[in-house]
Interface confidence: low
């Protein structure tokens, strides 16, 4: 399924390179960000026609949703844009790239929209540098989990256009100073560090200057080492359900896991009148499990169509990662169809709820 799961805090209009096939990138954007997902052809070869899918449904291009063969842009993202995105080969439906996108209220790492902070002619004849978005620079302390992407911004202007340089703990900071390097985007007044590690902790200072003056801002970065844990399942899910014979039922299971989780849906069964085997393990049948082209999002829902009385019983959502397993169970009760109830009532039978 994949080579690893990475959680990133990415900035506005940050282009995210496509993961290895089967790998699921977990991406966090701020509300209002431009979500830009990139899925280059594997091995650099021709990819053929592709389709972008969100939560299992094909995306329709619009003024806000820009769809290209290898790139997807969602402008002015909101909570509704959170979900599981994938780029698939149109003919085979093979998943080329998966992305799990979460849109949060907070702007990502004090970022701003692409291009908004580019150098501008202010109309002032001459002038020392000044911050163009000081309200975006309030967050002086940034604490992020290891493996996230961090972006510091110091949007500024001046005339002549000032230069920007970066210091770490008071010393000049260059790409060769860290494994993985850094990205300096002068047009956006930004410093980007991907996949941060504990050694990236420290004070980062942007120095913006021209011949009329100099201004600086210091940010403190703390990198939190994740304490690995087995998957966490959202309380109350799946929920017990009561359904009428022949109706459709959905069980939901929300899984939170740093390490890539494997999700299975199980139905408890009896074997020779026993619910558990000789080792105390419950007898179950696996209804749904990870396939090569099944997204985690799809696995978080178990759909039962046209239920029969045999479908009644206990269902379990089982999620496991390299640390351990968690599971929640729920019961399905199947009631006779209403007309059957009426007929039964007329016959004098009583149904106990």
């Amino acid at each position: 399924e994949s080579l690893g799961t990475e959680q990133r805090v990415v900035g506005r209009a940050a282009e995210v390179p496509g993961p290895e096939p089967g790998q699921q990138e977990q991406l966090v954007f701020g509300s209002g960000d431009a979500v830009e997902l990139s899925c280059p052809p594997p091995g650099g070869g021709p990819m053929g026609p592709t389709v972008w899918v969100k939560d299992g449904t094909g995306l329709v291009p619009s003024e806000r949703v820009l769809v290209g063969p290898q790139r997807l842009q969602v402008l002015n993202a909101s909570h509704e844009d959170s979900g599981a995105y994938s780029c698939r080969q149109r003919l085979t439906q093979r998943v080329l790239c998966h992305f799990s996108v979460r849109v949060t209220d907070a702007p990502s790492s004090g970022d701003d929209e692409d291009g908004e902070d580019e150098a501008e002619d202010t109309g002032v004849d001459t002038g020392a540098p000044y911050w163009t978005r000081p309200e975006r620079m309030d967050k002086k302390l940034l604490a992020v989990p290891a493996a996230n992407t961090v972006r510091f911004r110091c949007p500024a202007a001046g005339n002549p256009t000032p230069s920007i340089s970066w210091l770490k703990n008071g010393r000049e900071f260059r790409g060769e100073h860290r494994i993985g390097g850094i990205k300096l985007r002068h047009q956006q007044w930004s410093l980007v560090m991907e996949s941060v590690v504990p050694s990236d902790r420290g004070n980062y200072t942007c120095v913006v200057e021209n011949k009329f003056g100099s201004i600086r801002q210091t940010y403190t970065l703390d990198v939190l080492e994740r304490s690995p844990h087995r998957p966490i399942l959202q309380a109350g899910l799946p929920a017990n359900q009561t359904a009428v014979l022949g109706s459709d039922v959905e069980f939901h299971c929300k899984v939170y896991s740093d390490a890539q989780p494997h999700i299975q849906w199980l139905k408890h069964v009896e074997v020779n009148g026993s619910k558990v085997g000789p080792d105390g393990t419950p007898y179950v049948t696996v209804l749904k499990t990870a396939g090569a082209n099944t997204t985690d999002k799809e696995l978080e829902v178990l759909s039962l169509h046209n239920v029969t009385f045999e479908d009644a019983g206990e269902y379990t959502c089982l999620a496991g990662n390299s640390i351990g397993f968690s599971h929640h169970s729920a019961w399905l009760v199947v009631l006779p169809a209403e007309e059957e109830l009426v007929e039964a009532d007329e016959a004098g039978s009583v149904y106990a709820g």
Epitope: E1, S2, L3, G4, G22, Q23, A259, Q260, H262, Q264, L266, V269, V271, G277, T281, P282, Y283, V284, T285, V286, L287, K288, T289, A290, G291, L318, G320, N321, S322, F325
Partner: antibody, heavy 126, light 111 residues
Framework: QVQLVQSGAEVKKPGASVKVSCKAS????????MHWVRQAPGQGLEWMGW????????NYAQKFQGRVTMTRDTSISTAYMELSSLRSEDTAVYYC???????????????????WGQGTLVTVSS | DIALTQPASVSGSPGQSITISCTGT?????????VSWYQQHPGKAPKLMIY???NRPSGVSNRFSGSKSGNTASLTISGLQAEDEADYYC??????????FGGGTKLTVLG
């Protein structure tokens, strides 16, 4: 005793398809996952995917996605593996292998191939 | 496509002990105790020799034993016999590819 008997050797041209069968006996066919593993001449073992004979559910290795189809016929306790768009590098011995964990098993991770078919040689040549 | 690394060949004299290693990563061998070993004689189907790192199926000689340290699993054959000459494959559950095999090790029992 448990036995998995596979169909005979096949010679195919590039671009064609091949369908290999695996007849199970000596146990309840629908109670155990059936996997397919192949071995090119002089090479190692390569897992292709599994089928749950109880539900018909499948899981294919990424490499074979779109080219392989695994099916079963519970009435005759037989699993099938069909590989399409054959190329010369598909020349191999194809094995069906029963995994020790049953379709009732709690965890699917503990995959142990306790019984194997005798293998079917598929030769792809123009 | 080989995810687990095994030595291409090992050899030993009758009565000796040999060890075959199988190196993976934390997402396969190192992450789970689901390592199996298979023996394959020429022209035959593989046979399960060890499962869950160190357990032997019934009928397998106690000369075969398995262990694991970190990301490396090992198969040890003690009191080597001529009939032990075969190819040996390790197999592990893998977090991302589901099932992975090693490239195989040819065991030669000398003269």
């Amino acid at each position: 005793q448990v036995q998995l008997v596979q169909s005979g050797a096949e010679v195919k041209k590039p671009g064609a398809s091949v369908k290999v069968s695996c007849k199970a006996s000596g146990y309840t066919f629908t109670s155990y996952y059936m996997h397919w593993v192949r071995q090119a001449p002089g090479q190692g073992l390569e897992w292709m995917g599994w089928i749950n004979p109880n539900s018909g559910g499948t899981n294919y290795a990424q490499k074979f996605q779109g080219r392989v189809t695994m099916t079963r016929d519970t009435s005759i306790s037989t699993a099938y593996m069909e590989l399409s768009s054959l190329r010369s590098e598909d020349t191999a011995v194809y094995y069906c292998a029963r995994s020790m964990n049953s379709t009732m098993y709690w965890y699917l991770r503990r995959v142990l191939f306790d019984h194997w078919g005798q293998g079917t040689l598929v030769t792809v040549s123009s | 496509d080989i995810a687990l690394t095994q030595p291409a060949s090992v050899s030993g004299s009758p009565g000796q002990s040999i060890t075959i290693s199988c190196t993976g990563t934390s997402s396969d061998v190192g992450g789970y105790n689901y390592v199996s070993w298979y023996q394959q004689h020429p022209g035959k189907a593989p046979k399960l020799m060890i499962y869950d790192v160190s357990n032997r199926p019934s009928g397998v000689s106690n000369r075969f034993s398995g262990s694991k340290s970190g990301n490396t699993a090992s198969l040890t054959i003690s009191g080597l016999q001529a009939e032990d000459e075969a190819d040996y494959y390790c197999q592990s559950y893998d977090m991302y590819n589901y099932i992975v095999f090693g490239g195989g090790t040819k065991l030669t029992v000398l003269g």
